[in-house]
């Protein structure tokens, strides 16, 4: 976990101001509206069954 303005989050994660910690970009498939997802290169689309089982 990083404070803003210090070393960046590790590869595959992005800083969340809302949660005040680095978060896994992989979470953006499930929670695409999360603030940290803006810092993730590309959030892969969820499999059909995860979104609409």
């Amino acid at each position: 976990e990083q404070a803003p303005g210090t070393a960046p989050c590790s590869r595959g994660s992005s800083w969340s101001a809302d949660l005040d910690k680095c978060m896994d970009c992989a979470s953006c498939r499930a929670r695409p509206k999360s603030d940290f997802c803006l810092g993730c290169a590309a959030a892969p689309p969820a499999p059909f069954r995860l979104l609409w089982p």
């Epitope: 896994d24 992989a26 979470s27 498939r29 499930a30 892969p44 499999p47 069954r49």
Partner: antibody, heavy 119, light 111 residues
Framework: EVKLEESGGGLVQPGGSMKLSCVAS????????MSWVRQSPEKGLEWLAE??????????HYAESVKGKFTISRDDSKSRLYLQMNNLRAENTGIYYC??????????WGQGTTLTVSS | DIVLTQSPASLTVSLGQRATISCRAS??????????MQWYQQRPGQPPKLLIK???NLDSGVPARFSGSGSGTDFTLNIHPVEEEDAATYYC?????????FGGGTKLEIK
């Protein structure tokens, strides 16, 4: 400190009903997906049901084995999670865990409450 | 449903040595970028505890002697060096789709 505390377990006869409850503290309950997971010697760990956020219109998802029998619900104002279980059978015996996750994993677990279905 | 098969069912490892636990999924749980596989530790009488999410990412507070690897259908949890407190049952869990499922568990004993 994160805490999830289940209650409502006990002994129930086959065909009976039971409602489990879980009270959460130490994290932002209304920003977490919540689930119930059962553990039994026969079937190990089984995910049963999930409820998402208000922004998801409290979408719910169920394992096929409990669909139509179990109902998950939440009360964000009380930081509480519920599981209404109807038409219980012996195979529903086990430890029921209340779990919370920011996304599609289980960050936080309660200590569990034991349900025994037997005549 | 995706079936997760763990191996071995149990293993005994000497203190300070390496423990390797495998989890095989009945279909791929990975995209080109991420793998949707978690690992949990359950000590006797306790609930499971999240160790690793998305195949490789240690949860906060988890010691660096735990590591996860793999993609597609084959995943591995490594513990090195093993400590006495690592005696527990370890489970994998996928989040590729609903229903989420768990592996049958691997019981680790320390000698």
């Amino acid at each position: 400190e994160v805490k999830l505390e289940e209650s409502g377990g006990g002994l129930v006869q086959p065909g009976g009903s039971m409602k489990l409850s879980c009270v959460a503290s130490g994290f932002t309950f209304n920003n977490y997906w919540m689930s119930w997971v059962r553990q039994s010697p026969e079937k190990g760990l089984e995910w049963l049901a999930e409820i998402r956020l208000k922004s998801d219109n409290y979408a719910t998802h169920y394992a096929e084995s409990v669909k139509g029998k179990f109902t998950i619900s939440r009360d964000d104002s009380k930081s509480r999670l519920y599981l209404q279980m109807n038409n219980l059978r012996a195979e529903n015996t086990g430890i029921y865990y209340c779990t919370g996750g920011f996304a599609d994993y289980f960050d936080y677990w309660g200590q569990g409450t034991t349900l025994t279905v037997s005549s | 449903d995706i079936v997760l098969t763990q191996s071995p069912a149990s293993l005994t490892v000497s203190l300070g040595q390496r423990a390797t636990i495998s989890c095989r999924a009945s279909q791929s749980v990975s995209t080109s970028s991420y793998s949707y596989m978690q690992w949990y530790q359950q000590r006797p009488g306790q609930p499971p505890k999240l160790l690793i999410k998305y195949a490789t990412n240690l949860d906060s507070g988890v010691p660096a002697r735990f590591s996860g690897s793999g993609s597609g259908t084959d995943f591995t949890l490594n513990i090195h060096p093993v400590e006495e407190e690592d005696a527990a049952t370890y489970y994998c869990q996928h989040s590729w789709e609903i229903p989420y499922t768990f592996g049958g568990g691997t019981k680790l004993e320390i000698k």
